[in-house]
Amino acid sequence: RAPRCRELPAQKWWHTGALYRIGDLQAFQGHGAGNLAGLKGRLDYLSSLKVKGLVLGPIHKNQKDDVAQTDLLQIDPNFGSKEDFDSLLQSAKKKSIRVILDLTPNYRGENSWFSTQVDTVATKVKDALEFWLQAGVDGFQVRDIENLKDASSFLAEWQNITKGFSEDRLLIAGTNSSDLQQILSLLESNKDLLLTSSYLSDSGSTGEHTKSLVTQYLNATGNRWCSWSLSQARLLTSFLPAQLLRLYQLMLFTLPGTPVFSYGDEIGLDAAALPGQPMEAPVMLWDESSFPDIPGAVSANMTVKGQSEDPGSLLSLFRRLSDQRSKERSLLHGDFHAFSAGPGLFSYIRHWDQNERFLVVLNFGDVGLSAGLQASDLPASASLPAKADLLLSTQPGREEGSPLELERLKLEPHEGLLLRFPYAA
């Protein structure tokens, strides 16, 4: 008799793929544009990335450091009108893209939460949650919560409002903290909260360190759903050298949880390469004309247009990983087992029941390495085969689809491999 199929877990929409943050509408659209109507015209691009949700804004009225002149129910006229927002929501829904609204109150000011009148501010947030839920948004984000006093109790209250409206609504909290204990204390009283943090931001050093960070986090959070990013708002290039971007894309898309990216992460957008651009929100490079300030500063291979035409580009890798992440059961909700593969390497398996399984091997080092995969670390339910098919490599030159002998696996510097193999009873 065939073994019984394992019961599928309840899957919320944010479990099914990546979230894409557009914190600065003007920087995202460029050319002096930057409103909701313009963003609507970019939804096809977001669809092509196969992302499941757009984290937008903040876009509300906020006079810097002035509680009274901050209105979370009103869209700043610079970004458009409520009608523009409704129209964006409708278009996004048609493309199966969910919209999450950032309600961080004092986003133009010194302290995101004003550090004053918390009763008034919290009431404004509460009213805003109710208002925008009725308007049809799919969730909310609040950032810098390490600077909100009694954050846990407020998050619990806001979570109740959000989930009370519908279980299908999401609350994301962001913190600059990278301290696991602080992160856990924020998660403690908030069961379904998705938390973005700087926890992984110093993981770029070695495979062992990254493995240790990831496994510690997963062990500490138990079976709750995680999100994976390097910060609550900033670009990957703020933390990583260019040669590790592909490796991190592969890792973020294949860890158990929701990957969260900022606009531009898919093309390796780097503020440092664009003189005069702010680190936190450089202009998005749609094509070579997107940054006219310094002629010749932008080459085609730095842009969406250029990378779209190159199957070996970072953007093409992002699209492929996003596609895999959203359709493979083992990547959607599969079990995760990390195991030893030798110094400098981080390797793990994702598997779900009798579905196709995935092996990820990441070389963080700047020298080529032979992987010594220690299958003995793995439980019987996740055993390794002798060979696995190469689904993709972060480096060019490998023949995709070809079977690789796992005992003889060699990785180039900064190379990541995604391999697949079938379930064997």
Epitope: D65, F114, S115, V118, D119, T120, K126, N147, K149, E157
Partner: antibody
Framework: EVKLEESGGGLVQPGGSMILSCVAS????????MNWVRQSPEKGLEWVAE??????????HYAESVKGRFTISRDDSKSTVYLQMNNLRAEDTGIYYC????????WGQGTLVTVSA | DIQMTQSSSYLSVSLGNRVTITCKAS??????LAWFQQKPGNAPRLLIS???ILETGVPSRFSGSGSGKDYTLSITSLQTEDVATYYC?????????FGGGTKLEIK
């Protein structure tokens, strides 16, 4: 115009009880955290207690020195905050102010509590 | 509990001069700091909250600065009506605590 008016102070013997009231007007009382703060020449300004909103389940916090003896409560329908003080001690003597918000953007003029035999 | 320390109990400053009053917290308070002014016989009056945010109606000669554990109240040009006692208060975590106060006098 925001107004806070305390009442209920006076002379009380050690071990005795007293209830202070603070009536508020000129703002949405039910949306405001309310505090009691006291002042004495010996201890200066000393925060006593805070009460939050209905949506926070009327959460309360107290200074260590009054925990178990003082109780803060509110009646949103009357825009009034109370401080029930039991087992009073000489060191509880001072002017008691109620204040609105976090921090106290508005204060009443205070009511004097004297604990003496 | 977080202790708040105002280093000067008394300050004597000439009219028109700049005044700086400092306040140190025993732990990080993430800018959840207020400055109050109190004149004899009156209740305290909030001048600054959130370490830097000037309350409506407070003269622009008053300003607040600082972050982490160290905070400062400045008066650019001392006026007669500024004679008072100034208190800092942290309201980041309960129990909220006040500094001991700095009494400002005209030299």
């Amino acid at each position: 115009e925001v107004k806070l008016e305390e009442s209920g102070g006076g002379l009380v013997q050690p071990g005795g009880s007293m209830i202070l009231s603070c009536v508020a007007s000129g703002f949405t009382f039910s949306n405001s955290w309310m505090n009691w703060v006291r002042q004495s020449p010996e201890k200066g300004l000393e925060w006593v207690a805070e009460i939050r909103l209905r949506s926070n389940n009327y959460a309360t916090h107290y200074a260590e020195s009054v925990k178990g003896r003082f109780t803060i409560s509110r009646d949103d329908s009357k825009s009034t905050v109370y401080l029930q003080m039991n087992n009073l001690r000489a060191e509880d003597t001072g002017i008691y102010y109620c204040s609105r918000g976090d921090p106290g953007a508005y204060w009443g003029q205070g009511t004097l509590v004297t604990v003496s035999a | 509990d977080i202790q708040m320390t105002q280093s000067s109990s008394y300050l004597s400053v000439s009219l028109g001069n700049r005044v700086t009053i400092t306040c140190k917290a025993s732990d990080h308070i993430k800018n959840w700091l207020a400055w109050f002014q109190q004149k004899p016989g009156n209740a305290p009056r909030l001048l600054i909250s959130g370490a830097t945010i000037l309350e409506t109606g407070v003269p622009s000669r008053f300003s607040g600065s600082g972050s982490g554990k160290d905070y400062t109240l400045s008066i650019t040009s001392l006026q007669t009506e500024d004679v008072a006692t100034y208190y800092c208060q942290q309201y980041w975590s309960t129990p909220y605590t006040f500094g001991g106060g700095t009494k400002l006098e005209i030299k």
